[in-house]
């Protein structure tokens, strides 16, 4: 006869490990007992349990409540045992010794591998700002046994580098993703993907990129000269910019205070019925936490009685 077993038994932390040991013999052969032991390179052989055909299962007190026979129905030639709630310390080599009649003794060894699934964490890097050079966008760390694989899934262009840290019973892997920040990356996902044999599917953690920027400012509203004539209503100047964080807008007049009746509403400057008093240089000041920009325009309100005058538009940042 011979023993049927496995070279390696793999189990996830906290699950039950079935240590297989089945005697495949002639029909008239019997298994008297099966002795299970842990084989430790330092401590030698340590008895785990004894499975007797007549007296049943006897478990070493060190493994009390942790070693059981598989649930019925049981084959009398099956010496397999269950190791409940596997922990990392259980990892190692195990031996079953089978005493049979009349064929004698057989033994087999197997390795128990306990997988420790990782719990990944993603840490965003420092605040990203347009104009920076290569900058850490995020780092992702996962610790497990064996070492997990940490990769990045993103459409954003960058470079990644990984390093691992070996501990007595596990390994931690840290992967960093660096990029050159640009406004086009705003809102783009950067996903850390962790793979491990103890996971049924990859673990994914997504970080949404935020890149601070402030666009150049410009002023719209002077395109139609006919709107800027004495008596006209509804004339407005609109300041155009964009940024992250969203910018705040402030309007001033270069050559004095804003005329009475001129109303500021965010990015828009609204005028009452126009008079020549509204002529002047108006400045839009755009700012966010990153930067500030200015754009100025010269408004000249035309008097229809004086057709020689033209609207002048000067924009400077």
């Amino acid at each position: 006869g011979e023993l049927e077993t496995s070279d390696v038994v793999t189990v996830v932390l906290g699950q039950d490990a079935k240590l297989p040991c089945f005697y495949r013999g002639d029909p008239d052969e019997q298994v008297g007992q099966v002795a299970w032991a842990r084989v430790d390179p330092n401590e030698g052989i340590r008895e785990l349990a004894l499975l007797h055909s007549k007296y049943g299962l006897h478990v070493n007190p060190a493994y009390e409540d942790r070693v059981e026979q598989p649930p019925p129905p049981r084959d009398p030639l099956d010496g397999s045992v269950l190791l409940r709630n596997a922990v990392q310390a259980d990892e190692g080599e195990y031996e079953c010794r089978v005493s049979t009649f009349p064929a004698g003794s057989f033994q087999a060894r197997m390795r128990l591998r306990v997988l420790v699934p990782p719990l990944p964490s993603l840490n965003p890097g420092p605040p990203l700002e347009e104009g920076q050079g290569l900058t850490l966008a995020a780092s992702c760390t996962a610790e497990g046994s064996p070492a997990p694989s940490v990769t990045w899934d993103t459409e954003v262009k960058g470079t990644q580098s990984s390093r691992s840290f070996t501990h007595p019973r596990s390994a931690a892997v840290t992967s960093e993703f660096h990029l050159v920040p640009s406004r086009s990356m705003n809102g783009q996902p950067l996903t850390c993907v962790v793979s491990h044999p103890g996971l049924l599917q990859d673990r994914r953690i997504t970080h949404t990129l935020q890149v601070a920027f402030l666009a150049e400012a410009s002023v719209r509203g002077l395109e139609d000269q006919n709107l800027w004539q004495v008596g006209r209503e509804g004339a407005t100047l609109k300041c155009l910019s964009e940024g992250q964080p969203p910018p705040k807008y402030n309007w001033t007049r270069l050559d004095g205070p804003l005329p009475s009746g001129v109303r500021v509403k965010g990015d828009t400057l609204g005028f009452p019925p126009l008079t020549t008093e509204h002529s002047g240089v108006y400045v839009c000041h755009v700012s966010n936490e990153l930067s500030s920009r200015d754009s100025q325009v010269t408004v000249e309100v035309l008097d229809p009685e004086d057709p020689g005058k033209q609207v002048d538009l000067v924009s400077a940042s």
Partner: antibody
């Protein structure tokens, strides 16, 4: 001025262990974001990355050679080391160390050291 | 295993422009780096992050990347540009740093 200089056993026999040293000046192995890599180039062939070691003692190895490689560092002397066990003739190559900084790979290289494995 | 593919050799007439290519599936999402190797000299990085040129590198060298191809362009090629050129990129796999096989540039 950043410089890296490799040194180590020039000639050794198959099955021996190869030990290499990278002596660094112009930057510190303690600086956050600094890593040192080992790269090799067999005669007439291309470059092959072997291993990294970083400021925080994190390490990276080429999976195809991992079980034979060991990388370490001595921050007090600003040196990085590479050990390759059980060498054979295919390990004959010029070995380089190079700096990585802040995610930017291999911005400075050493001159390289020639290693010959011969019986 | 991930590969960066470079033509083994190319040549250029003195004063002309030559483009060296590097093809890899991950290059749309990963920066390319270019290194110059001359006999008995240290390896020098000539382009980083696809298109940036380190200080001290001639402005005759430029880099670009489009899709799965990164390109190193040398204009007004000089005799001193004769060298082996290697591209490099990090692979999406966490464990590998990859070099192309290298292109030997001959200046005629």
């Amino acid at each position: 001025q950043v410089t890296l200089k490799e040194s180590g056993t020039g000639i050794l026999q198959p099955s021996q262990a190869l030990s290499l040293t990278c002596s660094i000046s112009g930057f510190s192995l303690n600086t956050t974001g600094i890593c040192v890599s080992w790269i090799r180039q067999p005669l007439g062939q291309g470059l092959e990355w072997l291993a990294d070691i970083c400021w925080d003692d994190g390490k990276g190895y080429n999976p195809s050679l991992k079980n034979r490689l060991s990388i370490s560092k001595d921050t007090s002397n600003n040196q990085a080391f590479l050990k390759i066990t059980r060498v054979d003739t295919t390990d004959t190559a010029t070995y380089y160390c190079a700096r990585n900084y802040g995610g930017n790979p291999f911005d400075y290289w050493g001159q390289g050291v020639m290693v010959t494995v011969s019986s | 295993t991930y590969e960066l593919i470079q033509p083994p050799s190319t040549s250029v007439t003195l004063g002309n422009t030559v483009s060296l290519t590097c093809v890899g599936d991950d290059l749309p999402r990963r920066y390319a780096y270019w290194y110059q190797q001359k006999p008995d000299q240290s390896i020098v990085r000539v382009i980083y992050e696809d298109s940036k040129r380190p200080s001290g590198i001639s402005d005759r060298f430029s880099g670009s990347s489009s899709g799965t191809t990164a390109t190193l362009t040398i204009r007004d090629a000089q005799a001193e540009d004769e060298a082996d050129y290697y591209c490099h990129s990090t692979y999406s796999d966490d464990k590998v740093r990859v070099f192309g096989g290298g292109t030997k540039l001959t200046v005629l």
